[in-house]
Amino acid sequence: PPNRRTCVFFEAPGVRGSTKTLGELLDTGTELPRAIRCLYSRCCFGIWNLTQDRAQVEMQGCRDSDEPGCESLHCDPSPRAHPSPGSTLFTCSCGTDFCNANYSHLPPPGSPGTPGSQGPQAAPGESIWMAL
């Protein structure tokens, strides 16, 4: 379809780099959540940092191209990296408007399918790009 994809846009304070230029930020009349209209893909993404007690959103926005996973209707995150011991980054890609606003579910830390606690470690910030 010719219409462009619109996604939720968010970047946590301290995250290095930005995906802001992958789309056009929209004025939706409310402070949050922000919306971004994708330029180069029809695909949204989300990254969450899962620790023992909570999941915290790190980034949400547009992908720079359509890739496997972008055909998903919903955000179903999968584990990608370990920014620090006891936390795991989960990412999703999906291809409907605002599909990255929230995830459908996250597996509990340490459950099957989550990389073991001895998995690859990354410096803060770097891990976001590993996840993308």
Epitope: P2, N3, R4, T6, T21, E24, L26, D27, T28, G29, A35, R37, L39, Y40, S41, D64, S65, D66
Partner: antibody
């Protein structure tokens, strides 16, 4: 200062392939934004042909999709247009332009391409 | 694709007068209330020059006598007081849907 410059043959024979180069200075084509080809027909109408983004993703005007190819050489900071099976209707001034988001903020001076035998 | 119709085709005015140019889209060019319509000026032998983006935002370096307004399908470019250098052809462009499309242009000529 961002500058774009088109180059290529000014005369192309019908049924052949039109090939143009856009050389960009003052900005890396891999840094950001998208790099477009736009043409202007003798009647002054403008047509967006397609782009290649900083990351290499490509989008074409559906009216040209079967004939157009846009590519790039990042080492030379150049991007290219190929348009196959040209006819007299492809005679136009061809511009390369940068799109900052979805509008065109920097343009080349344009090059006239005439399709004639 | 979205068709943009500009009117009038030619506008004959004198320096100092107000110019009002219209661009009508075959369907809405808004996304969640944001208008993806842009305006360019073109002089003979030159490429188009960006004046206004997203309906009403003035491009850096463009004089404040140029302004844009409108939403959904109807947009206007206004030149509050025509200067001699403003006599040119003006084009609208939409980017709400692929492919990007341009209007046919309005020529502003000296009366």
């Amino acid at each position: 200062q961002v500058q774009l410059q088109e180059s290529g043959p000014g005369l192309v024979k019908p049924s052949e392939t039109l090939s143009l180069t856009c050389t960009v200075s003052g900005y890396s084509i891999t840094s950001d934004y998208a790099w477009n080809w736009i043409r202007q027909f003798p009647g002054k109408g403008l047509e967006w042909m397609g782009y290649i983004s900083y990351s290499g993703s490509i989008s074409y005007n559906p009216s040209l999709k079967s004939r157009i190819t846009i590519s790039r050489d990042t080492s030379k900071n150049q991007f290219f247009l190929k348009l196959s099976s040209v006819t007299a209707a492809d005679t136009a001034v061809y511009y390369c332009a940068r799109s900052r988001y979805s509008w065109f903020d920097y343009w080349g001076q344009g090059t006239l391409v005439t399709v004639s035998s | 694709e979205i068709v943009l119709t500009q009117s009038p085709g030619t506008l004959s005015l004198s320096p100092g007068e107000r110019a009002t140019l219209s661009c009508s889209a075959s369907e809405s060019v808004d996304t969640y209330g944001n208008s993806f319509m842009h305006w360019y000026q073109q002089k003979p032998g030159q490429p188009p020059r960006l004046l206004i983006y997203r309906a009403s935002s003035l491009e850096s370096g463009i004089p404040v006598r140029f302004s844009g307004s409108g939403s959904r399908t109807d947009f206007t470019l206004t030149i509050s007081r025509l200067e001699p250098e403003d006599f040119a052809v003006y084009y609208c462009q939409q980017s709400n849907e692929d492919p990007y499309t341009f209007g046919g242009g309005t020529k502003v000529e000296i009366k």
